[in-house]
Amino acid sequence: LPKAPVITTPLETVDALVEEVATFMCAVESYPQPEISWTRNKILIKLFDTRYSIRENGQLLTILSVEDSDDGIYCCTANNGVGGAVESCGALQVKMKPKITRPPINVKIIEGLKAVLPCTTMGNPKPSVSWIKGDSPLRENSRTAVLESGSLRIHNVQKEDAGQYRCVAKNSLGTAYSKVVKLEVEVFARILRAPESHNVTFGSFVTLHCTATGIPVPTITWIENGNAVSSGSIQESVKDRVIDSRLQLFITKPGLYTCIATNKHGEKFSTAKAAATVSIAEWSKPQKDNKGYCAQYRGEVCNAVLAKDALVFLNTSYADPEEAQELLVHTAWNELKVVSPLCRPAAEALLCNHVFQECSPGVVPTPIPICREYCLAVKELFCAKEWLAMEEKTHRGLYRSEMHLLSVPECSKLPSMHWDPTACARLPHLDYNKENPKTFPPMTSSKPSVDIPNLPSSSSSSFSVSPTYSMT
């Protein structure tokens, strides 16, 4: 007799591991024999799908190699035309050993920033993720946390966070380990010991010391007055991420020396700077040595003051005499911009003729100092107030550099023109000019009169003072 189908063994939940076989059984009693169809998540499973095997007149569904995407609800439906169709459903739970789908990668990070080491996992049951640093399990703290995704987040990365990391994914079916990755913490260059300023005598040796650290270890470069150091020797040593640089200099001129520590972070650089000054205590020393040569002046500052084509003494105590002496007059010249109109031309004449002394060529080129009388004229007549102020400043140490000491002569140490008229140089700018009495102001000063003789008129007098100008 015809009999409507009855499912005698309802489908059950099946647990299966990936790549294993999973079978659902749907035993049906009926007459005539029913047609049995299978669905997964309400989608018909086709008979010719090679991933499945349907046997026993459709009562057995076998998944030949389970994939993680096979989980879902499987239903069998039996129908033989007698009565209604019957259905039974069961779930396939794909069990999966832990698998790391996005492993961590090597990371370089600058100290103080946030680092995230990824570790995305798969597995059923859902794996728990932990991290190992070096050989020990990583303990979470206020800066370190394992995110829901399994990634490791480190806030405010510190040097001590650097090291080797791996993540571990674990569930009831097994454990998976990522490859070991490196977290490198880079640190901006920082100067630990800055060079110290020195005040030394001309021609002495000075060692400037600069120590820096950073990751990677920085390089140190030295700058002299804004340019790469051209002379001197540099010794360097590196120990425990600290670089120590010593610059040894032979001092022939004052300078500003800057230690620059630089390291590279990807395409960017970080730098740290520290500077020291080297000043010269006895600027007048090179002049005493009288080592040098005679040559025409070809600078700029004293061009209008010195006689055209005059031979000047270039002092080879300096590495580059011409430049050193020009720098000297330039520095002092700038200070003369503020002096009175009476003082300025006289002071400029004195300055240029003192730094670029007239030179007597011969077997031994000899500088000819300015005659004392002319020096005193500038000091006590033309620039009395200014000279006094400058000497006060010097005594009170208000000059930042000692450079002006070379550019201002000590009048008392200069030879007098009365001793030997050929042994000292005159300043034509200060000579009384009979044709043009305006070139020398009336001596209304109450100071002792300065012994400037009535010299022959000079065609190169270059400044003129109003006769009504009176010194106060």
Partner: antibody, heavy 121, light 112 residues
């Protein structure tokens, strides 16, 4: 790294004008004198013009006086050579060169790679 | 205007010594001319070797030295190297003639 890069060269007709520029980097430009030196094809070096660190004076070779003007913009770290009334004998590679110190004259311790100026009709 | 004179060409054996000179068509070269020396290899910009007669620029090998020889300035290469083969120019400051800087015609040095 110290660099001097000349630009502005090219082909110009006799009587025409060109302005050469020299961009300086890697050193304190306003601490140094600068010069222009030229070299005609297959010939020797010829000094053209010089200027000290502050631009306060300018100096020229006799044959270019009144036609060429050297100038500098220390803020822009650039040296210029304005060339007017150009002649065929001005055809040369023009080098910008740095002095070893402040004043206009003396050893030229750094040179650019040069820019070619061709004066031809 | 005075012309700065140099030997058109000179040759030296590797390891040998050679002296290049720099004179004036009228008169002597003195310290007031501040003689400078330059080296130029083909296709390259010139390079300064010596300034103000005898001061060597930094990075210039010690085999290059400057001096006066008679009424001329001189550049001496002691222990010449193959890489010294180049054109050498001297340059003089001419202060009396409205401040000029004049190059010599150059010396082609061959290291055989």
């Amino acid at each position: 790294e110290l660099q001097l890069v000349e630009s502005g060269g090219g082909l110009v007709q006799p009587g025409g004008s060109l302005r050469l520029s020299c961009a300086a980097s890697g050193f304190t430009f306003d601490d140094y004198g600068m010069s222009w030196v030229r070299q005609a094809p297959g010939k020797g070096l010829e000094w053209v013009s010089a200027i000290p660190w502050n631009g306060g004076s300018t100096y020229y070779k006799e044959s270019v006086k009144g036609r060429f003007t050297i100038s500098r913009d220390n803020a822009k770290k650039t040296l210029y050579l304005q060339m007017n009334s150009l002649k065929s004998e001005d055809t040369a590679v023009y080098y910008c060169a740095k002095r070893s110190g402040r004043i206009a004259f003396g050893a030229l311790d750094a040179w650019g790679q040069g820019t070619l100026v061709t004066v031809s009709s | 205007q005075a012309v700065v004179t140099q030997e058109p060409s000179l040759s030296v054996s590797p390891g040998g010594t050679v002296t290049l000179t720099c004179g004036l068509s009228s008169g002597s070269v003195t310290s007031s001319n501040y003689p400078d020396w330059y080296q130029q290899t083909p296709g390259q910009a010139p390079r300064a070797l010596i300034y103000s007669t005898n001061s060597r620029l930094s990075g210039v090998p010690s085999r290059f030295s400057g001096s006066f020889s008679g009424n001329k300035a001189a550049l001496t290469i002691t222990g010449a190297q193959p890489e010294d083969e180049a054109d050498y120019y001297c340059a003089l400051y001419m202060g009396s003639e409205s401040r000029n800087y004049v190059f010599g015609g150059g010396t082609k040095l061959t290291v055989l």
